[in-house]
Amino acid sequence: EVEKTACPSGKKAREIDESLIFYKKWELEACVDAALLATQMDRVNAIPFTYEQLDVLKHKLDELYPQGYPESVIQHLGYLFLKMSPEDIRKWNVTSLETLKALLEVNKGHEMSPQVATLIDRFVKGRGQLDKDTLDTLTAFYPGYLCSLSPEELSSVPPSSIWAVRPQDLDTCDPRQLDVLYPKARLAFQNMNGSEYFVKIQSFLGGAPTEDLKALSQQNVSMDLATFMKLRTDAVLPLTVAEVQKLLGPHVEGLKAEERHRPVRDWILRQRQDDLDTLGLGLQGGIPNGYLVLDLSMQEALS
């Protein structure tokens, strides 16, 4: 807390300008009117205040707006935003995407701070859903943003927003998140032709069910091994050797290098060795010839 002291004669601030950087903390407290500061917030960012001085300016705004700052002030906080606590930000009502962008710009190039996370949360909740423009903005500043959301939060993403997602935005997503995003992507890209569709859907395929993989295998997509290795194991297991061969196209040779890793390892164990041999890759571990395969899950369903 800065002590209340009278402003020295002739030092009362008539406007927010560069002369204030030479004011001591107590002088800022005594000589800068909070209402003046609020109306000239757009100037603060251009003035080289120290963070110690910004603390004083924040204190003045807190006194003026105990219930939370209005958006007209928030939009121009600039570096003062870094002085806000998550508790401060929870009092705000941020509705403008321009305000969000302005504040994210301040933190650009740095990890997502608790302040930024709270700001985004407030903004998205205020909008009711993660629309395309918001998602566009957030992933531009934080490519991993989408994968930081829970499956429940992702469920509020409308399919139209999926167009804003780039492959790198999904790098850190786990299968549970892709399970939610894949159906939205499928819906978003449904009117595209085969090859264009595959390019767009590829990074979401970690959430694809078996039937969709079977359908893709009929379209000469030539899936690369990196994508194949990210598929759900339970979706890959029912695929036949012929289907996997068609799905991977020329990349099928890469299975050999991955035969000890999931989902390739588990898939091999489910295939007849005879069928695996047709690939000519030397894949071992399939079901020996002459053995009968009982699908116990089907048997249970019938009984």
Epitope: P48, T50, K83
Partner: nanobody, 115 residues
Framework: EVQLVESGGGLIQPGGSLRLSCAAS????????MGWHRQAPGKGLELVST???????YYANFVKGRFTISRDNSKNTLYLQMNSLRAEDTAVYYC?????????WGQGTLVTVSS
């Protein structure tokens, strides 16, 4: 983190000149602006001069025309050229870097102006 180390202080006669240096290291890419502050014996800390990343400079009235602040980005060093020194310039001079999201300070260098 940003580390700052000042040098160049010493005993100088009134009317003389000194050049202070401040070598910055660490996360220097996060620095927004840097400055020189001073604290005279028994007095509070006061800002002498500031320079922004784009080279805009600001001076306190009591040093205008006598002191010059500059930066050498290739050496990550901040300078304060002090000319026409007076007895009242005697103080510990501190280098400060305002970087994301705090202020970093050097340990200070003593300048004594005395005949």
């Amino acid at each position: 983190e940003v580390q700052l180390v000042e040098s160049g202080g010493g005993l100088i006669q009134p009317g003389g000149s000194l050049r202070l240096s401040c070598a910055a290291s660490g996360n220097i890419g996060s620095i927004r602006h840097m400055g020189w502050h001073r604290q005279a014996p028994g007095k509070g800390l006061e800002l002498v001069s500031t320079i922004t990343t784009v080279g805009t400079t600001y001076y306190a009235n009591f040093v205008k025309g006598r002191f010059t602040i500059s930066r050498d980005n290739s050496k990550n060093t901040l300078y304060l050229q002090m000319n026409s020194l007076r007895a009242e310039d005697t103080a510990v001079y501190y280098c400060r870097a305002t970087a994301h999201p705090t202020d970093y300070w050097g340990q200070g260098t003593l300048v004594t102006v005395s005949s």
